[in-house]
Amino acid sequence: MMTGTIETTGNISAKKGGSVILQCHLSSTMAQVTQVNWEQHDHSLLAIRNAELGWHIYPAFKDRVAPGPGLGLTLQSLTMNDTGEYFCTYHTYPDGTYRGRIFLEVLESSVAEHSARFQIP
């Protein structure tokens, strides 16, 4: 029975040209995490973190994806095309697969500064 839950950073926004941390956290389970996959909105894989092998960053993202913190992913040099859904898929034993969703909105610098200034605390 799958008892775990995935907590994510949810909906986030970041400046064009900046960087953002995509973070998922698996809780409420003792299952062993064997692999975490990070996918983009078009289902292309950005990176994999395998417990036996380490991190594999896919060639298309090697220049602007950095592992971590933890099992998260840092996406750098953001462009408007990076706007969209991101998915973390936790492969665990014995539970099976858990999946989390993050929506990233990349904003023009001036818009990002404006929206940040008026965020509700």
């Epitope: 692999q35 395998n50 417990a51 036996e52 092998l53 380490g54 991190w55 592992p67």
Partner: antibody, heavy 119, light 107 residues
Framework: QVQLVESGGGVVQPGRSLRLSCAAS????????MHWVRQAPGKGLEWVAV????????YYADSVEGRFTISRDNSKNTLYLQMNSLRAEDTALYYC????????????WGQGTMVTVSS | DIQLTQSPSSVSASVGDRVTITCRAS??????LAWYQQKPGKAPKLLIY???SLQSGVPSRFSGSGSGTDFTLTISSLQPEDFATYYC?????????FGGGTKVEIK
């Protein structure tokens, strides 16, 4: 005891193919990731490829990607490396190796099998 | 890919000496570093994994330290059987990569 024995090496012409085998014994082969590492004569170690316990999760060094294929037959406790389009720079002693689970160090190695690519 | 730079490439030492070998990674690799010993005509032997954990059966004169980009293998008192080539290997990123090796020779 835990043992890995490679075979299949030899002299081959550039552009040809060769298949290496690695027979495993003394441990639960079907639950272990397995690696190939090579060493050119008088040179250092170069990681070549890895395969997951169930035959998935295959990854390769850039130098062999698209030419080499790692595979395994868990019913025969055997690991394979199919090497196509061989080049002179593939000349090396090829080792299969078993990792320490979740520690990412290679604790059991075979004796190696020599591959010489020459016209 | 992560480059590992070992130094020195060779070192001459006597029995009883303390020998230190360093391995520098081109990017941070946390503590995912292993050390191997290789003697001529033999397969490598795992000494240290996780930067500092001693592999079972390896003498306690071998020790490893470091994290991030800078790592060290120390042989506290060199024994005759320790003359060999030593390699570091990172396992934070695929592809795994090895350092160029350090040959420990008899002075």
């Amino acid at each position: 005891q835990v043992q890995l024995v490679e075979s299949g090496g030899g002299v081959v012409q550039p552009g040809r193919s060769l298949r290496l085998s690695c027979a495993a014994s003394g441990f639960t082969f079907s639950s272990s990731y397995m690696h190939w590492v090579r060493q050119a004569p008088g040179k250092g170690l170069e990681w070549v490829a890895v395969i997951g316990a169930d035959g998935s999760n295959k990854y390769y060094a850039d130098s062999v990607e698209g030419r080499f294929t790692i595979s395994r037959d868990n019913s025969k406790n055997t690991l394979y490396l199919q090497m196509n389009s061989l080049r002179a720079e593939d000349t090396a002693l090829y080792y299969c190796a078993k990792p320490v689970p979740r520690r990412r160090g290679l604790d059991v190695w075979g004796q190696g099998t020599m591959v010489t690519v020459s016209s | 890919d992560i480059q590992l730079t070992q130094s020195p490439s060779s070192v001459s030492a006597s029995v009883g000496d303390r020998v230190t070998i360093t391995c520098r990674a081109s990017q941070g690799i946390s503590s995912w570093l292993a050390w191997y010993q290789q003697k001529p005509g033999k397969a490598p032997k795992l000494l240290i994994y996780g930067a500092s954990s001693l592999q079972s059966g390896v003498p306690s004169r071998f020790s490893g330290s470091g994290s991030g980009t800078d790592f060290t293998l120390t042989i506290s008192s060199l024994q005759p059987e320790d003359f060999a080539t030593y390699y570091c290997q990172q396992a934070f990123y695929l592809p795994w990569t090895f350092g160029g090796g350090t040959k420990v020779e008899i002075k």
